[in-house]
């Protein structure tokens, strides 16, 4: 290599841990294999449950705003879910990224696709709930699931415009122990006259925006909305809260304990440009929080069937009841400070026909045995527990 | 080929000012993070000050913060120290030396002696 | 500050030989390490980086190992080039600190 051969620039951070060599050690090599096995479960489980919620509400349940913000959720976390396998051979193979740069980069991106998502649709959810309490009579004109599905399409197109710095700046940077890591590399595009600047700027961007972006903004939101809708709430004098409710709680309390570490340790990671003592507190507690980040999205389709009151009960009907039944809407159950009737203009409005898939006439084979499992596919939407439950009054 | 010369040198009585200069060539000076090394007769090396490739960031070690400044001049590739409230012990072959790439000095300068002494 | 502990401070060698010298930092400092070796009147030459990666042109008789806090430098075979001051360098946090040398001398 001549005097003046640049080498690819790193930020210092980055350089540093490129310089990190694997140990050899017995006991590390367990966590190693257990990492392996824990993170493999995770990926089967994700894509199995998330495949599930996707096809009995989004195939076999009469489509609501509810359930097209579920549809959405479990859509973001299928997508983390199938890119989990690929972070298990990485973990498998040693820590190495043997999958070269470009898949690096679509693999992070669908990471951070997630985490945009996820938050930005907790965010709609909640005020979309504050809007049904606060305007119902907006609401009711306005709330249509075609309208829900216009709103996750923007949602989604604002995930992917946030993703698109960690798309262009994920890199595979090779290790001096011949491993190679899928990371940042701020300096990739444009790194400026400084570096060091660059470095620093770049990183505590990043930083700081996903942190606001992605989790402060969309909790503000939905505290603010849970805040408006229990003051409103509370003057009409309901007390216990929807199923709904509950579900929404679980989930935003899911996603604040699984992604709130990793923002802390990203935050701390960019701080530690400008003081290296934080870096190994970094390096040894950053992929213990990506996989929390990550396991997010395996919880919340067991979520969304545990927060059905009398669970084990309704376990043992088909998951399409229990899923129907947990997402009921509120104003399809008359809630709270609207009248008890059948409101037949917002059913309608929410069963539009933005269904994902097609009802078949009668399933035959193993589709019997889904059909079973699932609920009977051929059931008219009019005759199922969510139509029923339209004429009772809110739990 | 890779040249750092050291100049500005000197005796100086405590107290005083020198200004030393590093003319560098042979590599694209601006991409590079520089600094200086200094050796007391028959001692050892002691790192003094470092500056980023754009000079936006330096760092020193306690021994001459405050008292020493690093700079550089990328248009004329060129690195400096200015060294204030010299002292005795200040008295050294001062080296100026280029990052390898964050770190590990891979070329360095001659050096020239820098002489505090009344 | 982190301190750098080389030892031995000097020792003697033949042609041929092979000869460890060892560098212990007062606290981890993650490979974060360079080795150089200087000969009277002359400006250091880096060795050694990030604690096991041999720098350019110099001989692969050179190699460096370690980890964690305890550093080593090793000359498989010493040359009559060879016999010159060592220092290590860590590079870990500010202020990066040299060990004080081990001077080899020819036996």
């Known amino acids: 290599m001549s005097a003046n051969a640049t080498l690819k620039p790193l930020c210092p951070i980055l350089e540093q841990m490129s310089r990190l060599q694997s140990h050899s050690n017995t006991s590390i090599r367990y966590i190693d294999h257990a990492a392996v096995l824990l993170h493999g479960l995770a990926s089967l489980l994700g894509l199995v449950e998330n495949g599930v919620i996707l096809f009995v509400v989004g195939c076999r349940m009469r489509q609501t705003v509810v359930t097209t913000w579920v549809l959405h959720l479990a859509l973001s976390d299928l997508l983390a879910s199938a890119s989990l396998p690929f972070f298990t051979y990485f973990l498998a193979v040693g820590h190495s990224w043997e999958l070269g740069t470009t898949f690096c980069k679509l693999h992070s991106s669908i990471f951070f696709l997630n985490m945009f998502a996820s938050g930005f649709l907790l965010s709609a959810i909640s005020l979309d709930r504050c809007l049904q309490v606060v305007r119902p009579v907006w609401a009711q004109n306005h709330r249509t699931v075609a309208a829900a599905h216009k709103v996750c399409l923007v949602l989604w197109a604002l995930a992917v415009l946030n993703t698109v710095p960690y798309f262009v700046f994920r890199d595979t940077i090779s290790r001096l122990d011949g491993r190679i890591m899928c990371y940042y590399n701020v300096l990739l595009l444009n790194p400026g006259p400084d570096r060091d600047a660059t470095c620093n700027s770049r990183q505590v961007a990043l930083a700081v925006s996903k942190f606001l972006l992605a989790f402060l903004v969309p909790l503000a939101i939905i505290a603010s909305s849970h805040a408006a809708v229990s003051l409103r709430l509370q003057h009409r004098g309901r007390r216990r809260p929807g199923r709904f409710v509950r579900l929404v709680a679980a989930v935003v309390a899911a996603f604040a304990l699984c992604w709130g570490p990793y923002h802390v340790f990203s935050l701390l990671e960019a701080r530690a440009h400008a003081n290296p003592g934080l870096r190994p507190l970094v390096w040894r507690g950053l992929p213990f929080v990506t996989s929390l980040a990550f396991f997010n999205s395996v919880a919340n389709p067991v979520l969304y069937v545990l927060t059905c009151p009398d669970m084990l009960r309704k376990l043992r009907r088909s998951l399409r009841t229990v899923l129907e039944s947990v997402l009921v809407d509120d104003s399809e159950l008359g809630g709270a400070g609207s009248s008890r009737r059948r409101r037949t203009s917002s059913t309608a409005r929410s069963a539009s026909p933005l269904a994902l898939c097609s009802r078949p006439e009668e399933p035959r084979g193993p589709a019997r045995l889904l059909g079973w499992l699932l609920g009977s596919c051929a059931a008219s939407p009019q005759t199922g527990p969510l139509n029923r439950a339209l004429s009772s009054t809110s739990s | 080929e890779v040249q750092l010369v050291e100049s500005g040198g000197g005796l100086v009585q405590p107290g005083g000012s020198l200004r030393l200069s590093c003319a560098a060539s042979?590599?694209?000076?601006?991409?590079?993070?520089m600094s200086w090394v200094r050796q007391a007769p028959g001692k050892g090396l002691e790192w003094v000050a470092y500056?980023?490739?754009?000079?936006?960031?330096?760092d020193y070690p306690g021994t001459v913060e405050g008292r020493f400044t690093i700079s550089r001049d990328n248009s004329k590739n060129t690195l400096y120290l200015q060294m204030n409230s010299l002292r005795a012990e200040d008295t050294a072959v001062y080296y100026c030396?280029?990052?390898?790439?964050?770190?590990?000095?891979?070329?360095w300068g001659q050096g020239t002696l820098v002489t505090v002494s009344s | 500050d982190i301190q750098m502990t080389q030892s031995p401070s000097s020792l003697s060698a033949s042609v041929g030989d092979r000869v460890t010298i060892t560098c212990r930092a007062s606290?981890?400092?993650?490979?974060?390490l360079a080795w150089y070796q200087q000969k009277p009147g002359k400006a250091p030459k880096l060795l050694i980086y990030?604690?096991?990666q041999l720098a350019d042109g110099v001989p692969s008789r050179f190699s460096g190992s370690g980890s964690g806090t305890d550093y080593t430098l090793t000359i498989s075979s010493l040359q009559p080039e060879d016999f010159a001051t060592y220092y290590c360098?860590?590079?870990?946090?500010?202020?990066?600190?040299f060990g004080q040398g081990t001077k080899v001398e020819i036996k």
């Open positions: 042979g590599f694209t000076f601006s991409s590079y993070s």
């Open positions: 500056i980023s490739n754009g000079g936006s960031t330096t």
């Open positions: 030396a280029r990052h390898r790439t964050n770190w590990d000095f891979d070329y």
């Open positions: 990030a604690a096991t």
């Open positions: 360098q860590h590079f870990w946090i500010t202020p990066w600190t």
């Open positions: 606290e981890n400092i993650y490979w974060n």
